[in-house]
Interface confidence: low
Amino acid sequence: ESALITQQDLAPQQRAAPQQKRSSPSEGLCPPGHHISEDGRDCISCKYGQDYSTHWNDLLFCLRCTRCDSGEVELSPCTTTRNTVCQCEEGTFREEDSPEMCRKCRTGCPRGMVKVGDCTPWSDIECVHKESGTKHSGEVPAVEETVTSSPGTPASPCSLSG
């Protein structure tokens, strides 16, 4: 089944704005920082700070730049060839299973465990059992079992059943 192009799948309002540069595609592809025109004859530059493309491509329009969420810091801005780089704020991390949000790092390890890894923007603190050295699965312990690694008392637990 071949790919079919119809007018409704093209972007009629995506014509080059006056400030956008044009060049010719090479073997049907446009370089990073550009997208291809509707007729396939021109490469049109992405708009700095608004959109980008990272590879040689035949995209009909550039990718929209990511806006860092609240709770994130911008490490580097969006350019025409590279998306914004966002990172979780200090004390929070982005988990592989839920990459859409930054989660608070735990303040300490459960009783009988020691901290061997700090909170980073991409990982929670790491805890291992004192005796065996095996890693903790990551379930949050009941509050009274928490050994805090910073001063202050842990927050009160919600009513726990079971």
């Epitope: 035949d58 995209l59 929209r64």
Partner: nanobody, 122 residues
Framework: EVQLVESGGGLVQPGGSLRLSCAAS????????MGWYRQAPGKQRELVAE???????NYADSEKSRFTISRDNAKRTVNLQMNSLKPEDTAVYYC????????????????WGQGTQVTVSS
């Protein structure tokens, strides 16, 4: 609102074939890349194959010879023909589309279907 609906998953024996389909609908102005990703239990979601509006394809290395992606821009569908399936292909398969909604100037790459389970087992 944009919806992506997958179909075609199921249980198949090793060496068998399946054809996954995904249809995009809703307030769509245009679609750039469409693709298939998969997520096995305990693993990260990974690209299987993607296809541009003009039919240029990109496959994960391990699937290049066994899988074929195709699309119909008029119907706004993308298909994944999977042959010579192996137990390690067992995963939830997700359709992804880079969509520009009507009345907007950008497309967003984060439209996903709900996923369809593919199980390869004897």
């Amino acid at each position: 609102e944009v919806q992506l609906v997958e179909s075609g998953g199921g249980l198949v024996q090793p060496g068998g074939s399946l054809r996954l389909s995904c249809a995009a609908s809703g307030s769509i102005d245009s679609i750039n890349n469409m693709g298939w990703y998969r997520q096995a239990p305990g693993k990260q979601r990974e690209l299987v194959a993607e296809i541009t509006p003009r039919g240029r394809t990109n496959y994960a290395d391990s699937e290049k010879s066994r899988f074929t992606i195709s699309r119909d821009n008029a119907k706004r569908t993308v298909n994944l023909q999977m042959n010579s399936l192996k137990p390690e292909d067992t995963a939830v398969y997700y359709c992804n589309a880079e969509v520009r909604e009507r009345g907007t100037s950008w497309y967003r790459p984060d439209y996903w279907g709900q996923g369809t389970q593919v199980t390869v087992s004897s």
